[in-house]
Interface confidence: low
């Protein structure tokens, strides 16, 4: 029995719901007192949901999966995560058997927007060209970990005294801080830019400093 | 400054295949995602493959088991490799900075015909 | 058929007001940042608005962008014969797994 799930991950923002995809081709005269149709966590195989005898057996997995019961009689047996948690990610394997059997595995990427940057500087008044001043780029409850990059106001990366730390909180959302250490020119923007892998999602926040005063765009 | 130089295209057969090229310069290569779009003469806008700074590869529906991008810091170059051309895949391709393509080449052109 | 929907063509007389609307879903336009491009006859395209709302240097600040649920908009204040052009929206797909751009709006300057 072929059992097909997509290829590439699916990917799913924290608290929205997740499908994930698999289907199988019923054979003519096929009924569902005939399916038994497991879903479980790949690695420890932890039950996830399952349908048997006719009967959905319901969630083993927090009360927060379904199945699609109208569509499993044409193949269908894709399972419908609820409020995707970043504990939720990871791979899935679809168990269908009728008379023979087959399972494929569909992973599950988490995924959670990071919030605009909020900037700021250190020390605050009083620059000259020649300071050396410390820049602070904050943006937090993001996943996966962030890719940070700054950039001067030609867009010129700056790679060099920038110190980033990632940290996640009790949900698994990462709060990510950049420090960069820069000697100030005669005026100057920095920008930091905040970038999820895996939404492809770039967050950015900036501060031009003119000697006086700083503006924070 | 920033610039972006792609050569390799031409005329080419449908079942052929043709390598694209995009020479970067003025700006840390290695540190940038980049992309191939593409436009069919007298159409839109089309985005045919992306690969992040750390070479994972993204591809549109159309070219994806056809096409390759590539990509070789050490000669700041990016690469198409096109393979199984059809007709549809006549356009102008351009390489750019970012999948959001800040940064454009001038294009070059693949034809594919018999 | 683009997943963007854009209306082919737009049109306004120098000095006035244009919107470009674009349509999406909550898959891209909804979760995701949009882009907008200025394609002039004849050249490549070129960026005129980054991460929704942003300009590159360069750029009038006669250009805007916004979005709002799954739609996003460019707006030209203080139209001029120059901007007579493509213009394309575009963001990333979460479902597509791959970025997107939209059909196109010829804008004509009357």
């Known amino acids: 029995l072929e059992v097909q799930v997509p290829e590439d991950p699916v990917v799913a923002l924290v608290g929205t719901d997740a499908t994930l995809c698999c289907s199988f081709s019923p054979e003519p005269g096929f009924s569902l007192a005939q399916l038994n149709l497991i879903w479980q966590l790949t690695d420890t195989k932890q039950l996830v949901h399952s349908f048997a005898e006719g009967q959905d057996q319901g969630s083993a997995y927090a009360n927060r999966t379904a199945l699609f019961p109208d569509l499993l009689a044409q193949g269908n047996a894709s399972l419908r995560l609820q409020r995707v948690r970043v504990a939720d990610e990871g791979s899935f394997t679809c168990f269908v058997s009728i008379r023979d059997f087959g399972s494929a595995a569909v992973s599950l990427q988490v995924a959670a927007p990071y919030s605009k940057p909020s900037m700021t500087l250190e020390p605050n008044k009083d620059l000259r060209p020649g300071d050396t001043v410390t820049i602070t780029c904050s943006s937090y409850r993001g996943y996966p970990e962030a890719e940070v990059f700054w950039q001067d106001g030609q867009g010129v990366p700056l790679t060099g005294n920038v110190t980033t730390s990632q940290m996640a909180n009790e949900q698994g959302l990462f709060d990510v801080h950049s420090v960069l250490r820069v000697v100030l020119g005669a005026n100057g923007t920095y920008s930091c830019l905040v970038r999820n892998p895996v939404l492809q999602q770039d967050a950015h926040g900036s501060v031009t400093i003119t000697g006086q005063p700083m503006t924070f765009p | 400054e920033v610039q972006l130089l792609e050569s390799g295209g031409g005329l080419v057969q449908p079942g052929g295949s043709l390598r694209l090229s995009c020479a970067a310069s003025g700006f840390s290569f290695s540190n940038y995602d980049m992309s191939w779009v593409r436009q069919a003469p007298g159409k839109g806008l089309e985005w045919v493959a992306g690969i992040r700074s750390g070479s994972r590869t993204y591809y549109a529906d159309s070219v994806k088991g056809r096409f390759t991008i590539s990509r070789d810091n050490s000669k700041n170059t990016l690469y198409l490799q096109m393979n199984s051309l059809r007709a549809e895949d006549t356009a102008t391709y351009y390489c750019?900075?970012?999948?959001?393509?800040?940064?454009w080449g001038q294009g070059t052109t693949v034809t594919v015909s018999s | 058929q683009s997943v963007l929907t854009q209306p082919p063509s737009a049109s306004g007389t120098p000095g006035q007001r244009v919107t470009i609307s674009c349509s999406g879903s909550t898959f891209n336009i909804g979760t995701n940042l949009v882009h907008w491009y200025q394609q002039l006859p004849g050249t490549a395209p070129k960026l005129l608005i980054y991460l929704t709302d942003r300009r590159p240097s360069g750029v009038p600040d006669r250009f805007s962008g916004s979005k709002s649920g799954t739609s996003a908009s460019l707006a030209i204040s203080g139209l001029q014969s120059e901007d007579e052009a493509n213009y394309y929206c575009?963001?990333?797909?979460?479902?597509?797994?791959?970025?997107?751009f939209g059909g196109g709006t010829k804008l004509t300057v009357l």
């Open positions: 575009a963001t990333w797909d979460d479902s597509l797994n791959s970025f997107l």
């Open positions: 750019g900075r970012y999948f959001n393509m800040d940064v």
